[in-house]
């Protein structure tokens, strides 16, 4: 039961991570700029995201503009977009793998196969967490580097936006949830009796491989 509880917790965390990741990627709040110059009467805040940028006037009026050409965009922005989308798709794939091997489903009935699928889903979620982390950390690094560069004008300097914090949270949740799913399956034989055992009690014992023997290099 503890194993099932950890699985549920793991998958809940990864689902939360996926939602956070989706919101982080979609929101235009990766970089935030505050223009409050000496001669500027109306202060404005500029939000920059992966897909669009928005200008928020002090009156509260907001105007957003979707980036026009894909090829005209900076390479780092294109890479961040790609990694974000891939991370979300990888996490979705992880969820499908998990559902196939979850304790409460009957897609796969053999216990070892179920354990293997749950372990695989955990690894996939961890990969998704790492993929989410890369563009977030890269963007944060660029913002911080600009902040400490004396030749970058104040008007060009950016602050860390809410999307970055959401991205870090998403990555953390995916890594934690994926890690929990990996931990719930130390090996096929070491898991206590389950309601599936009766069906296979008369068959010859299966020779199962421990997780260290799986060809995990394909997932890293």
């Amino acid at each position: 039961m503890a194993s099932a509880g950890m699985q549920i917790l793991g998958v809940v965390l990864t689902l939360l991570g996926w939602v956070n990741g989706l919101v982080s990627c979609a929101l235009p709040m990766w970089k935030v700029t505050a223009f409050i110059g000496n001669s500027i009467v109306v202060a404005q805040v500029v939000w920059e995201g992966l897909w669009m940028s928005c200008v928020v006037q002090s009156t509260g009026q907001m105007q957003c503009k979707v980036y026009d050409s894909l090829l005209a965009l900076p390479q780092d922005l294109q890479a961040a977009r790609a990694l974000c989308v891939i991370a979300l798709l990888v996490a979705l794939f992880g969820l499908l793998v998990y559902l196939a091997g979850a304790k409460c489903t009957t897609c796969v009935e053999e216990k070892d196969s179920k354990a293997r699928l749950v372990l695989t889903s955990g690894i996939v979620f961890v990969i998704s967490g790492v993929l989410t982390l890369i563009p977030v950390c890269w963007t944060a690094h660029a913002i911080i580097r600009d902040f400490y560069n004396p030749l970058v004008a104040e008007a060009q300097k950016r602050e860390l936006g809410a999307s970055l914090y959401l991205g870090w949270a998403a990555s953390g949740l995916l890594l934690l949830g994926g890690g929990l799913l990996c931990c719930t399956c130390p090996s096929g034989g070491s898991q206590g009796p389950s309601h599936y055992m009766a069906r296979y009690s008369t068959s010859a014992p299966a020779i199962s491989r421990g997780p260290s023997e799986y060809p995990t290099k394909n997932y890293v």
Epitope: P150, A153, Q156
Partner: antibody, heavy 119, light 107 residues
């Protein structure tokens, strides 16, 4: 109008010292990053030093680190470059530069002052 | 240190010609590149920053572009007052370095 006027250049022997000054006017001096860039005769421009607004941080290339010191006096609206252990390769026109709120890099340049290091 | 390789070292063109000066960085500098114009006997003047952004007051015939680590300054229609030496400079990281300069003359 932004004005940067350098002074203090001249002839100095190798190993000697010199102090360059830059009088700033036409803007709020303590709001801006200030720098020195030099140009040896017939050579490319070379960044020498930068000081942040307020003077909290200074940045030097290895070629002058430990020999040159930048400072600023907010009360006098002045920038200084103390140059010690001067070498022949330090011979150049030294420009005082102001950063800008909107523009990156070296936005406003003074007319320059010539420093000659020779025995 | 990041090296900035500028070419050509000198260039002669006619009034009205389209002129392009290039600058290559020895490693990635993102868009942290500026272009300066130095007229004979004068101090350098900032023309372009962030590789493509024009300083206010600079004629629109000047433009900057970037392709990876290669940067270009283009004058769409050369004017007599454009006779000068042009320098590129990166400000990606310390030490900030300049290109060797391009001397632009009128034929």
């Amino acid at each position: 109008e932004v004005q940067l006027v350098e002074s203090g250049g001249g002839l100095v022997k190798p190993g000697g010292s010199l102090r360059l000054s830059c009088a700033a006017s036409g803007f709020t001096f303590n709001d801006y990053t200030m720098s020195w860039v030099r140009q040896a005769p017939g050579k490319r421009l070379e960044w020498v030093v930068t000081i942040s607004s307020g003077g909290g941080r200074t940045y030097y290339p290895d070629s002058v680190k430990g020999r040159f010191t930048i400072s600023r006096d907010e009360a006098k609206n002045s920038l200084y470059l103390q140059m010690n252990s001067l070498r022949a390769e330090d011979t150049a026109v030294y420009y005082c530069i102001r950063g800008d709120y909107r523009y990156d890099a070296f936005a406003y340049w003074g007319q320059g002052t010539l420093v000659t290091v020779s025995s | 240190d990041i090296q900035m390789t500028q070419s050509p070292s000198s260039l002669s063109a006619s009034v009205g010609d389209r002129v392009t000066i290039t600058c290559r960085a020895s490693e990635n500098i993102d868009s942290y590149l500026a272009w300066y114009q130095q007229k004979p006997g004068k101090s350098p003047q900032l023309l372009v920053y962030a590789s493509t952004l024009l300083v206010d007051g600079v004629p629109s015939r000047f433009s900057g572009s970037r392709s990876g680590t290669q940067f270009s300054l283009t004058i769409s229609s050369l004017q007599p007052e454009d006779v000068a030496r042009y320098y590129c400079q990166h400000y990606y990281s310390i030490p900030y370095t300049f290109g060797s300069g391009t001397k632009l003359e009128i034929k």
